[in-house]
């Protein structure tokens, strides 16, 4: 997945102000044993910092070596720093692990900007604030990298939670979550609640604060309000979904829905922004500009480069529109919509010159690889990656940032016809196709 513009976070000091949590609706699906309820030991197990990634604590090797690992649903390798690097406080020392096994194979992963490379092996892995299990998993020991690790981010590796099809060097390298499910009784699903703080955090605040939760093997009721709505996983590679309609403040963008998914739409916790295909981005920005026309913002702001600031506490949230994405539902001709606020798509940033003020960057950007529903989307919702049933669930997050007038929403059902036509079929480039 694209590095540079990838990687999320605002950590969760803020969340909903008191009195603004929504009441739980009662029309929920019946309980599924082992998959729902309370996962107290896993709640609040994520931390992070704006634009730098949500991470979970993991241990690797025997005796256990503790590392902070970026949670990334947009890739499929478990890869950790395994050599000294100026931005790493610690790294995996294979020679100190009695359970390390070398696979005698290298791996090279280039990004749009930057890369990492390393050596493949296996070792025992566990998640202290996760299920009480230890698994033998594939590990890429990163020996060399460029523009991959982030100074001050506090993570030393990456946990790719997507499917084997996009694993490097090829799909024969079993991803961590597949190994976990195969070797234990952990159900084949996980859920993420990423909590944006709504304001920038300094290093000490990040370390002391909560960034959200990764619930492995289940769904925790305390992390969301209302109902969970599910969209099918179109294909098991990335977590690919189908967007069938887009609205800005209730106004339909009126584009051929194929454009929304050109060449794919994915849910990716390792990307900061909501990234949209070029045509869709241009139409969306035009519509957002029109909706917020009481203020004129320079082009640099809409390109995500230019800071916009307001004196503390005066951000005019009301001039910015809500954005709704309609997703294919589980039932034929049925969709549902997820709605985010400017509190999600304006990303708080700190600048040395603006410490007394509230400053933001526009966190919707252009993509040449399809729609990426990054942290900007995920911070509004509790997201269930139900691999067992090949679907992704969305509910309003109990920690999303909002104001007294508007909240994020997940609503349905809506009648939408011919939704299958919204999916883009990427042309095959394998040898069999080339032969015809």
């Amino acid at each position: 997945t694209q590095h540079g513009i990838r990687l999320p976070l605002r950590s969760g000091l803020g969340g909903a102000p008191l009195g603004l949590r929504l009441p739980r609706e009662t029309d929920e699906e019946p309980e599924e044993p082992g998959r729902r309820g309370s996962f107290v030991e896993m709640v609040d197990n994520l931390r992070g910092k704006s634009g730098q990634g949500y991470y979970v604590e993991m241990t690797v090797g025997s005796p256990p070596q503790t590392l902070n690992i970026l949670v990334d649903t947009g890739s499929s390798n478990f890869a950790v720093g395994a050599a000294p690097h100026p931005f790493l406080h610690r790294y995996y020392q294979r020679q100190l692990s009695s359970t390390y096994r070398d696979l005698r194979k290298g791996v090279y992963v280039p990004y749009t900007q930057g890369k990492w490379e390393g050596e493949l092996g296996t070792d025992l892995v566990s998640i202290p604030h996760g299920p009480n299990v230890t698994v033998r998993a594939n590990i890429a020991a990163i020996t060399e990298s460029d523009k991959f690790f982030i100074n001050g981010s506090n993570w030393e590796g990456i946990l790719g939670l997507a499917y084997a099809e996009i694993a490097r060097p090829d799909d024969s390298l079993e991803p961590f979550f597949d190994s976990l499910v195969k070797q234990t009784h952990v159900p084949n699903l996980f859920s993420l609640q990423l909590c944006g703080a709504g304001f920038p955090l300094n290093q000490s605040e990040v370390l002391a604060s909560v960034g959200g939760s990764m619930i492995i093997g289940g769904i925790d009721h305390s992390l969301y309000t209302g109902s969970l709505w599910y969209t099918p996983i179109r294909r098991e590679w990335y977590y690919e979904v189908i967007i069938v309609r887009v609205e800005i403040n209730g106004q339909d963008l009126k584009m051929d829905c194929k454009e929304y998914n050109y060449d794919k739409s994915i849910v990716d916790s390792g990307t900061t922004n909501l990234r949209l295909p070029k045509k869709v981005f241009e139409a969306a920005v035009k519509s957002i500009k029109a909706a917020s026309s009481t203020e004129k913002f320079p082009d640099g702001f809409w390109l995500g480069e230019q800071l916009v600031c307001w004196q503390a506490g005066t951000t005019p949230w009301n001039i910015f529109p809500v954005i709704s994405l309609y997703l294919m539902g589980e039932v034929t001709n049925q969709s549902f919509r997820i709605t985010i606020l400017p509190q999600q798509y304006l990303r708080p940033v700190e600048d040395v010159a603006t410490s007394q003020d509230d400053c933001y960057k526009f966190a919707i950007s252009q993509s040449s690889t399809g729609t990426v529903m990054g942290a900007v989307i995920m911070e509004g919702f509790y997201v269930v990656f139900d691999r067992a049933r090949k679907r992704i669930g969305f509910a309003v997050s109990a920690c999303h940032v909002h104001d007294e007038f508007r909240t994020a929403a997940v609503e349905g059902p809506f009648v939408t016809l011919d939704m299958e036509d919204c999916g883009y079929n990427i042309p095959q480039t394998d040898e069999s196709t080339l032969m015809t």
């Epitope: 004129k296 800071l307 916009v308 307001w310 010159a353």
Partner: nanobody, 120 residues
């Protein structure tokens, strides 16, 4: 967009003086605050001095009594007169401006920086 163009940096001996200028151009609404910051490699950018359009200024403790910030509102330009320079003043000096578009909202702009080197 607003462009900030710094000038006046260079190499000077300890005890010497330099005058930095920063001219703003482009789509200017209300340059209420302008300032100078500096950065040495591996360290965070720090405030040197700042000034409002009304002329109120503030300084970092380390430069008080040696540096003077001023501005010409008609020319959208801010100046930094640096006297009694010390080797520890060596840094890249950046100009910044807050371009207010409403009572409390503004865009923050930075210049590209000008190198000041003080030799002992």
């Amino acid at each position: 967009q607003v462009q900030l163009q710094e000038s006046g940096g260079g190499l000077v001996q300890a005890g010497g003086s330099l005058r930095l200028s920063c001219a703003a151009s482009g789509r200017i609404f209300d340059l209420r605050d302008m300032g100078w910051y500096r950065q040495v490699p591996g360290k965070q950018r720090e405030l040197v001095a700042a000034i409002t359009s009304g002329g109120t200024s503030n300084y970092a403790d380390s430069v008080k009594g040696r540096f003077t910030i001023s501005r010409d509102n008609a020319k959208n330009t801010v100046y930094l007169q640096m006297n009694s320079l010390k080797p520890e003043d060596t840094a890249v000096y950046y100009c910044n401006a807050k371009n207010f578009f409403s009572a409390s909202g503004y865009f923050l702009y930075w210049g590209k920086g000008t190198q000041v080197t003080v030799s002992s």
